[in-house]
């Protein structure tokens, strides 16, 4: 039978670490991490890490009992967790019978938005105390709400990930820019900024709260040339406060009456 892995939480040091081993398996050949989407009972879904690793093809694989994977996450707070993946069989060959290196994976570490993760893995039995243990590590930065996987998460939807304001902005004259956008049912307060290298105009927008999308318009006084300037629309939804997803557009010349209005609905990350 071919070996598989059975993985479970192991928070403290592995028991093998306390024993002396004359020989230990070699290090991993490769370690990779990617996010995967899994459904949860609430109707939302969670993002988990798919951690996959490749074993080095040599006879030291015969000593291999397990591989331990530890993840440290750094965002607003720090998290740390480990799993130990035991091999169900001893390795009888250095490569898979069908060809290629032995490759295994574990799906289970939860992924939060915009978080840097440090993933480390080492084989067990590991090197003796006071010896350099063969290990491998990779970094993984989880995406934010604009990511194609993340944007449908409830937290992201509440931050406006699915809202498309369809911003249009045009220079009416040397002193003013007209900004039009589609409001969101998530909230009724917005701020529109016009900036070149610096902010040349801004306006707070408060629309009557309604549970549907409407088109809002605001005329913003500007202090200098506005054609080609960037418009940034920041929503203030109750669910995300000042950390909601911002949207961008570009100021063009206002068309003459009867000419179709050019659209520009580029998006940016929060804070962009």
């Amino acid at each position: 039978r071919e070996p598989t892995v059975q993985c479970g939480s192991e928070t403290g040091p592995s028991p093998e670490w306390m024993l002396r081993h004359d020989l230990t398996p070699g290090d991993l050949r490769d370690l990779r991490v990617e996010p995967v989407k899994t459904s949860v009972a609430t109707g939302d879904y969670s993002i988990l890490m798919n951690v996959s690793w490749v074993l080095r093809a040599d006879a030291s694989i015969r000593l291999l009992k397990a591989t331990k994977i530890c993840v440290t996450g750094k965002s607003n707070f720090q998290s740390y967790s480990c799993v130990r993946c035991n091999y169900t069989e001893a390795f009888q060959t250095q490569t898979r019978p069908s060809g290629g290196k032995w490759t295994f994976s574990y799906i289970g570490f939860p992924v939060e938005l915009n978080t840097v993760y440090f993933i480390g893995a080492h084989n067990i039995p590991n090197a003796n105390m006071n010896e350099d243990g063969p290990s491998m590590s990779v970094n993984f930065t989880s995406p934010g709400c604009l990511d194609h996987i993340m944007k449908y998460k409830k937290k992201c939807v509440k931050a406006g990930s699915l809202w498309d304001p369809n911003i249009t902005a045009c220079k009416k004259n040397e002193e003013t820019v007209e900004v039009n956008f589609t409001t969101s049912p998530l909230g009724n307060r917005y701020m529109a900024l016009i900036q070149h290298s610096t902010i040349i105009g801004f306006s707070q927008v408060s629309e009557p709260y309604q549970n549907k999308q409407t088109r809002a318009s605001v005329v913003i006084p500007v202090t200098e040339e506005s054609e080609g300037a960037m418009v940034q629309l920041t929503p203030y939804f109750p669910t995300c406060g000042s950390d909601c997803i911002r949207h961008k557009g570009t100021v063009v010349l206002c068309p003459q009456t009867g000419v179709p209005f050019p659209l520009d609905n580029n998006r940016s990350k929060p804070g962009g």
Epitope: D58, A59, R62, P97, G99
Partner: antibody, heavy 118, light 107 residues
Framework: QVQLVQSGAEVKKPGASVKVSCKAS????????MNWVRQAPGQGLEWMGR????????QYNQKFKDRVTMTRDTSISTAYMELSRLRSDDTAVYYC???????????WGQGTLVTVSS | DIQMTQSPSSLSASVGDRVTITCRAS??????LAWYQQKPGKAPKLLLY???NLADGVPSRFSGSGSGTDYTLTISSLQPEDFATYYC?????????FGGGTKVEIK
């Protein structure tokens, strides 16, 4: 049955390169590492390196690292070993040898004599 | 690199003799050892792997033993076709190395 058939004998001048081929049959080529071993006249066996035909991972003996290139063509189940900047002490029989479950050499080619002489 | 030291480098024996060849590794190779037989002008032939396992078609008069760093190949009753050179090889991890060889000659 498993067979490894190597290319014919070569005579080369010092500084030249030689490329030896090893055609495998009778098994799934990508399932086993292919090794190259050489034997100088009247001498012992010397492991030069190995290639995994599945993904072309190569591990060389440091002694040859700068001069040897191992490749493979899975479409014709053939492994190649090229040795460059030949010297007279590279005169040897070069063998391809297929690994077993681990790196014991279960099957060998018939050998290719490479003579380096000015 | 792991060094493999084989002894003796040559020996003379008669048909029916029991022959023993030893191989010492410079470090523990965890029984990852193979033995080969080579006749003049021919490629080596695998005799044993993992110290004790006979390769396909190898007669049972060949046997192996040992662990750690010290290993032995024994031919229980030498036959005329056994006169050849024998090599040990470790496969604990690259680079793989062979012993210097033991030439078994007719007395």
């Amino acid at each position: 049955q498993v067979q490894l058939v190597q290319s014919g004998a070569e005579v080369k001048k010092p500084g030249a390169s030689v490329k030896v081929s090893c055609k495998a049959s009778g098994y799934t080529f990508i399932s086993y590492w292919m090794n190259w071993v050489r034997q100088a006249p009247g001498q012992g066996l010397e492991w030069m390196g190995r290639i995994d035909p599945y993904d072309s991972e190569i591990q060389y003996n440091q002694k040859f690292k700068d001069r040897v290139t191992m490749t493979r063509d899975t479409s014709i189940s053939t492994a190649y070993m090229e040795l460059s900047r030949l010297r007279s002490d590279d005169t040897a029989v070069y063998y391809c040898a297929r690994s077993g479950g681990f790196d014991w050499f279960a099957y060998w080619g018939q050998g290719t004599l490479v003579t380096v002489s000015s | 690199d792991i060094q493999m030291t084989q002894s003796p480098s040559s020996l003379s024996a008669s048909v029916g003799d029991r022959v023993t060849i030893t191989c010492r590794a410079s470090e523990n190779i965890n029984s990852n050892l193979a033995w080969y037989q080579q006749k003049p002008g021919k490629a080596p032939k695998l005799l044993l792997y993992d110290v004790t396992n006979l390769a396909d078609g190898v007669p049972s008069r060949f046997s192996g033993s040992g662990s750690g760093t010290d290993y032995t190949l024994t031919i229980s009753s030498l036959q005329p076709e056994d006169f050849a050179t024998y090599y040990c090889q470790h496969f604990w991890g690259p680079p793989y190395t062979f012993g210097g060889g033991t030439k078994v000659e007719i007395k």
